[in-house]
């Protein structure tokens, strides 16, 4: 069955019981989703608004699915498997009487049950298993997944070490004058440019030596950190951003909502599952996007791909490629390519390499 | 790819029966839920029937309740739907329909098949 | 029981306007709303999913929006090959389906 392909997942509580306190609601879904992150790679974080990955309702009877619920007793919530829309999502009926004891139904234990599922997990034939498929109480400060449980999410999603396996592990701030530092992402923001990295991202203001660190989360909250590819049109106040197979859209520094999309509305083949590095010209008012060692050409006026892409890179980009990390223009005719710890930066009038630089050279290293 | 490619439609008389098959390829069958929709001449669409990836559960719509059958052999890689004691009002094109994976159907159909043409008169 | 009403039933526009379907639930069913494109004589095509996630292969001029019980279908610059008609959609109910034609 499916499982979600990335470490980093998010939740949403859509709306609130009336038989607990918020705190309360907000305490037992934290730590039904800490029992599995603590016994796998994955990390759970809570978003207010924004599309998240698991989203978790309170509903009665028909909802919005085919699965309406049954008044109180007999089903006590469900859950969807991995996946986008209503994948992941869980649903807890209103006509129970949710609690943080033993009267009632206890939230904490029937959303450790429910989560297990949004994380791919099917019923247990162990009466001792979480994931067995009825209710029952247990002491919940001594609650314990069974051998069976771990057995069963670990066969998904490994073990918690295999974080370690993941490049800088800790999220720790990269060091800015490190030799070796690549970007993830580079796009201008009007004079600013915006340096991304993990969870990170460095402000560079034109012409001045200081630069800022900051978390991704702390000015867009609803984003993703490892930002892959990001382009600027100006004209517009517009910054489009890439994770995997989709993109947000900032406008005058706000996400816009209905967002993330899917990269295949700009008209990439199904075989396109992440953008490598963006930028939008604005003299063609063209946005380049580089895939792997391909490259293809998107008309923003039409909103479509131009005919006769994709391109190689090495071919019509003198010196660059076969793969680029970042790339953003500037200047009103260079595009600065990074690749690794390297820069080029690149007239595209001339269709030349005019300069080699570090990555990190617009910090005064 | 992704392939659904329904059969078994044709003119029946009322209160016959047919059996309408859907040959699924391009994915892993057993994993999905799957579905009939129909659409009668000129009208819009309605949800017919679905059937869990393991055939465990079953559903269907009031109109069809009792009289047909939903049913799928995941070794063939095919859905069929089981109609019986037809009435004029079945007469539709009906689609096959694939789902999300997963214990729980999201009514979400992102494949549909070409659809066969079912009409029931005398 | 759930049901939806979609408006307009019908809507001529020509190519370059801007157009807006809208879906509407007699209660809330949160953001699991889809929206389907059909063309005479062919199957539906899933273009937006989860009220406001564009399908894959989808063109960028198509977007969704709304949750609870109000959702609208925008397409932003219509297209020649946008005349068809529209249907909103949630588990087991289909709205009755909007016909885009030409002005």
């Known amino acids: 069955g499916p499982v979600w392909r990335k470490h980093y997942i998010t939740y949403r509580i859509n709306n609130y019981t009336p038989d607990m306190n918020r705190e309360d609601v907000d305490y037992a879904i934290r730590k039904a989703f800490q029992v599995w992150s603590n016994v796998t790679p994955l990390k759970f974080s809570k978003i207010n608004t924004g599309m998240a990955d698991i989203l978790v309702v309170f509903a009665r009877g028909a909802h919005g699915d085919f699965h309406a619920f049954d008044g109180k007793g007999g089903i006590l919530a469900h859950a969807f498997g991995p996946g986008s829309g209503i994948g992941g999502d869980a649903h807890f009926d209103e006509d129970e009487f949710w609690t943080t004891h033993s009267g009632g139904t206890n939230l904490f234990l029937t959303a450790v049950h429910e989560i297990g599922h949004s994380l791919g997990l099917g019923h247990s034939s162990d009466p001792k298993a979480v994931m067995f498929p009825t209710y029952k109480y247990v002491d919940i400060n001594t609650f314990r997944l069974s051998a069976d449980d771990i057995r069963g999410i670990q066969s998904l999603y490994g073990d918690p070490k295999e974080n370690q396996r993941l490049p800088n592990p800790d999220n720790s701030e990269p060091a800015l004058c490190d030799p070796n530092l690549s970007f993830d992402a580079v796009t201008t923001v009007g004079n600013k440019i915006f340096f991304f990295k993990d969870r990170f991202f460095w402000l560079k203001v034109s012409e001045r030596p200081k630069t800022s660190v900051n978390l991704i989360s702390s000015l867009w909250p609803t984003l993703p950190s490892g930002i892959e590819a990001a382009y600027e049109i100006e004209a517009r106040n517009q910054v489009f951003l890439f994770k995997d197979d989709k993109y947000w859209l900032i406008s005058n520094l706000r996400p816009e909502p209905n967002y993330p999309k899917s990269i295949h509305s700009f008209g990439f083949p199904n075989f396109v599952k992440k953008i490598d590095a963006a930028v939008f010209n604005p003299r063609f008012y063209r946005t380049y996007f580089f895939v792997d060692n391909q490259y293809w050409r998107y008309d923003e006026r039409r909103q479509m791909m131009d005919p006769g892409y994709p391109k190689l890179i090495t071919k019509n980009f003198q010196g660059i490629g076969p793969k680029i990390d970042a790339v953003f223009y500037s200047k009103n005719k260079y595009y600065y390519f990074f690749q690794g710890s390297n820069q080029f930066e690149y007239d595209f009038l001339l269709q030349r390499i005019t300069k080699t630089l570090k990555s990190n050279s617009w910090f005064g290293c | 790819e992704v392939q659904l490619l329904e059969s078994g439609g044709g003119l029946v008389q009322p209160g016959g029966s047919l059996r309408l098959s859907c040959a699924a390829s391009g994915f892993t069958f057993s994993w999905y839920w799957m579905h009939w929709v129909r659409q009668a001449p000129g009208k819009g669409l309605e949800w017919v029937s679905g059937?869990?990836?393991?055939?465990?559960?079953?559903m269907y719509a009031d109109s069809v309740k009792g009289r047909f059958t939903i049913s799928r052999d995941n070794s063939k890689n095919t859905l069929y739907l089981q109609m019986n004691s037809l009435r004029a009002e079945d007469t539709a094109v009906y689609y096959c329909?694939?789902?999300?994976?997963?214990?729980?159907?999201?009514?979400?159909?992102?494949?549909w098949g070409r659809g066969t043409l079912v009409t029931v008169s005398s | 029981d759930i049901q939806m009403t979609q408006s307009p039933s019908s809507l001529s526009a020509s190519v370059g306007d801007r157009v807006t379907i809208t879906c509407r639930a007699n209660?809330?069913?949160?953001?699991?709303l889809n929206w389907y494109q059909q063309k005479p004589g062919k199957a539906p095509e899933l273009l937006i999913y989860a009220a406001s996630s564009l399908q894959s292969g989808v063109p960028s001029r198509f977007s969704g929006s709304g949750s609870g019980t109000d959702f609208t279908l925008t397409i932003s610059s219509l297209q020649p090959e946008d005349f068809a008609t529209y249907y909103c959609?949630?588990?087991?109910?289909f709205g009755q389906g909007t016909k885009l034609e030409i002005k």
């Open positions: 059937i869990s990836p393991s055939g465990g559960m079953t």
């Open positions: 959609q949630q588990a087991g109910i």
């Open positions: 329909a694939r789902d999300i994976v997963g214990p729980y159907s999201a009514g979400l159909f992102d494949y």
């Open positions: 209660q809330s069913i949160y953001t699991y």
